[in-house]
């Protein structure tokens, strides 16, 4: 089951996922002047079994002027160093990201990828928030949101984070003391949000699902 709508927006804060649950989809988007190759995939899909998850399909971009020339899918390590990281990429990924069962890591960049990533999240996905540069966390509740299924509808929990305009930034999990457990958080939403969205994916793993979208922008 995929999530409806976007995770909540918090003023002066951005969010990202540390790992992606199986079923998550990522648009294959190319930067300006490049286009997805005609035979190329529209989306990458996080799939897997009990022991291993990975991204199916490959995103490939080609120059808009040269329609038949495909670009390599995954840059070499040197090229990856040159590429800008996602908007909230921490210097060190949390240790448990790679070993989290049923989750995929952040997909590697592909050459001439667009400057934003568009994700379609599944129920159970957690995203983490931090204040943007120049703001600091004033209220330190759990700074995450989880996509939950309630009364047959999906909803995102409300992160307990307020960002105030002082020159200090909060960090992602793994870069500071752990915050309160999500289970212990007060839920700000009590009603069932009617926010459903069709999602049809033709794979062995899914038939008709529901979806949400997340756009991250690189700095």
């Amino acid at each position: 089951e995929l999530c409806d709508d976007d995770p909540p927006e918090i003023p002066h804060a951005t969010f990202k996922a540390m790992a992606y649950k199986e079923g998550t989809m990522l648009n294959c988007e190319c930067k300006r002047g490049f286009r997805r190759i005609k035979s190329g995939s529209l989306y990458m899909l996080c799939t897997g079994n009990s022991s291993h998850s990975s991204w199916d399909n490959q995103c490939q971009c080609t120059s808009s002027a040269t329609r038949n020339t495909t670009k390599q899918v995954t840059p070499q390590p040197e090229e990856q160093k040159e590429r800008k990281t996602t908007e909230m990429q921490s210097p060190m990924q949390p240790v448990d990201q790679a070993s989290l069962p049923g989750h995929c890591r952040e997909p590697p960049p592909w050459e001439n990828e667009a400057t934003e990533r568009i994700y379609h999240f599944v129920v159970g996905q957690m995203v983490y928030y931090q204040c943007v540069q120049g703001y600091r966390a004033l209220h330190r509740g759990p700074a995450e949101s989880v996509c939950k299924m309630t009364h047959g509808k999906t909803r995102w929990t409300q992160p307990q984070l307020i960002c105030t305009g002082e020159m200090e930034t909060s960090q992602f999990p793994g870069e500071e003391k752990p915050q309160a457990s999500p289970e212990g958080r007060p839920e700000s939403e009590t009603s069932c949000l009617v926010t459903t969205t069709d999602f049809q994916i033709q794979t062995e793993m899914a038939a008709t699902m529901e979806t949400s979208i997340f756009t991250t922008e690189y700095q």
Epitope: L42, Y43, F199, I201, T211, I213, T215
Partner: nanobody, 126 residues
Amino acid sequence: QVQLVESGGGLVQAGGSLRLSCAASGITFNDHTMAWFRQAPGKEREFVAARDWSDIITRYASSVKGRFTISRDNAGNTGFLQMNSLRPEDTAVYYCAAREGGVVAGVRSGAPYDYWGRGTQVTVSS
């Protein structure tokens, strides 16, 4: 010259139905994602629905889910938006849009769409 032309708008009573059409020329719908947006007076443009040509993803705004259905006739290069159980708050100008990539929806989703129609007015009276 790419053109998207919407039709099918009009005045309808609350609870009624309308079927919007979007005829495309200059592009083939069988390799473009098609979407519908709307803009009510004094409000920002709002995502309504989108569907890619492979039918991998079909996406609706939560406010129209269960009432509106997006469909497409790739052979006829036409897209449709079936609107049932219309409400006064559905009153807006409805725009058809297309892009080469996958579905983009949600709050700032209009920018990635490459081609736009001029819109058709839908008015729902109470």
